[in-house]
């Protein structure tokens, strides 16, 4: 992994002044052994509002790896394979927990951060707006 | 939100010896205002594949909510507004973190934990088994 | 329809910073992935940063990574670019653009950013 | 990085006959995964913004005229014009973009 140099400003573990604080263990207990979005189904490519995926890392957040997907197409294919522009491919999106190191650098201390991640993508009826 | 009792048994912040552990901020800097999936948008109403969203509590679970979604249908939404059983409507799942209050009760001690959630649904193409 | 429109240009100091922005209308903005590109005076089309769609993932060319920060306001349909301890070399006129998917299908008109002391 | 490489970077062309500038990229811009070819065409007009003209190789973008081409594979693409009118006059971009995005120099196309 990549070695962070550590900040000489991390607050103290014992200090309980820290806001509103807990003590977390990192030891995983995962019920999924499959890390990697690509490999857990092939849905993506079956779609018919198919995605990629996108990797991006961030050594300041943990997970530090997210994945996060990308529709392929504005429309959605069809039965003969085509894109069809009378439907939309949108990304389904999902608020996800993720640990900040706060201050930056710290390898004991974080902070909860929600972020918003799109997960995959579906084929929905556009809406169509009438002038009147 | 819930009172949970503390269990008496519940291990001291400052025990060196409790398996690597990290201080965590519960404040959670929140990117995204939406915290209903069903606000977010209707895709999952005017998607090919529809779902809806089950509600799913837990105490022990940080956060206590996160919702599920279930397809509708097995196969898919055609143009007609009919299912389509050529097509199927499969579940995009996705990791997420959660903390659970470890040992149970205690209010301020967590083990990271990795569920599997179903996100949305999307239609694929079947995968077709010919038989020799 | 969709329309892009840049703002935040100017004349500005070798080592100083700006912010431009990009309002954004006539298409639902949280489903897009935005990017920003750069065409120096009477040179070719350079790319600068990317965002998600949700603004979780960015992506920067070495040129101006750890200067430049990409970043939006889902709520308010506006796609930033903030420029840190800016160059002579910066000196280009900023294009936003909308990722259609793989390929960017709407550009605004661009917002002049000009180093020099 | 993958390196785009247009030709000609100039090209004197006459109204009514065809026009076609080459695009090679320093590794493949096929994926086999999704069986598509991540490049596309832009034309910038003078004094104007670029606006697209061909993704994925070969698909035209809405509004543009039939005139307009793409074709190509892996490594090597091609923009043709059938019959370049007055208005084609521009500088003509190719474009990869993945996870990065990278741009051809442009081929300036002028009437004679």
């Known amino acids: 992994g990549i070695t962070i140099p550590r900040n000489p400003g991390c607050p103290n573990s014992e200090d309980k002044n820290f806001p509103r604080t807990v003590m977390v263990n990192l030891n995983i207990h995962n019920r999924n052994t499959n890390t990697n979005p690509k490999r857990s189904s092939d849905y993506y490519n079956r779609s018919t509002s198919p995605w990629n995926l996108h990797r991006n890392e961030d050594p300041e957040r943990y997970p530090s790896v997210i994945w996060e997907a990308k529709c392929r197409h504005l429309g959605c294919i069809n039965a003969d394979g085509n894109v069809d522009y009378h439907m939309n491919s949108v990304p389904i999106q999902q608020e996800i927990l993720v640990l900040r190191r706060e201050p930056p650098h710290c390898p004991n201390s974080f902070r909860l951060e929600k972020i918003l991640v799109s997960v995959g993508c579906t084929c929905v009826t556009p809406i169509v707006h009438h002038v009147a | 939100g819930i009172t949970i009792p503390r269990n008496p048994g519940c291990p001291n912040s400052e025990d060196k010896n409790f398996p690597r552990t990290v201080m965590v901020n519960l404040n959670i800097h929140n990117r995204n205002t939406n915290t209903n999936p069903k606000r977010s948008s209707d895709y999952y109403n005017r998607s090919t594949s529809p779902w809806n969203l089950h509600r799913n509590e837990d105490p022990e679970r940080y956060p206590s909510v996160i919702w599920e979604a279930k397809c509708r249908h097995l196969g898919c939404i055609n143009a007609d507004g009919n299912v389509d059983y050529h097509m199927n409507s499969v579940p995009i799942q996705q990791e997420i973190l959660v903390l659970r209050r470890e040992p149970p009760h205690c209010p301020n001690s967590f083990r990271l934990e990795k569920i599997l959630v179903s996100v949305g649904c999307t239609c694929v193409t079947p995968i077709v088994h010919h038989v020799a | 329809q969709v329309q892009l429109v840049e703002s935040g240009g100017g004349v500005v100091q070798p080592g100083r910073s700006l912010r431009l922005s990009c309002a954004a209308s006539?298409?639902?903005?949280?489903?897009?992935?935005m990017t920003w590109v750069r065409q120096a005076p009477g040179k070719g089309l350079e790319w600068v940063a990317s965002?998600?769609?949700?603004?979780?993932?960015?992506y920067y060319p070495a040129s101006v990574k750890g200067r430049f920060t990409i970043s939006r306001d889902n709520s308010k349909n506006t796609l930033y670019l903030q420029m840190n301890s800016l160059r002579a070399e910066d000196t280009a006129v900023y294009y936003c653009?909308?990722?259609?998917?793989?390929?960017?299908?709407?550009w605004g008109q661009g917002t002049l950013v000009t180093v020099s002391s | 990085d993958i390196v785009m490489t247009q030709s000609p970077l100039s090209l004197p062309v006459t109204p009514g006959e065809p026009a076609s500038i080459s695009c090679k990229s320093s590794q493949s811009l096929f994926w086999s995964e999704s069986h598509m070819n991540y490049l596309a065409w832009y034309l910038q007009k003078p004094g104007q913004s670029p606006q697209l003209l061909i993704y994925?190789?070969?698909t035209r973008q809405s509004g543009v005229p039939d005139r307009f081409s793409g074709s190509g594979s892996g490594t090597d693409f091609t923009l043709k014009i059938s019959r370049v009118e007055a208005e084609d006059v521009g500088v003509y971009y190719c474009?990869?973009?993945?996870?990065?995005?990278?741009f051809g120099q442009g081929t300036k196309v002028e009437i004679k």
């Open positions: 006539g298409f639902t903005f949280n489903n897009y992935w």
């Open positions: 965002v998600s769609n949700t603004g979780s993932s960015t």
């Open positions: 474009h990869h973009h993945y996870d990065s995005h990278t």
């Open positions: 653009a909308r990722e259609g998917a793989y390929y960017l299908d709407y």
């Open positions: 994925y190789a070969s």
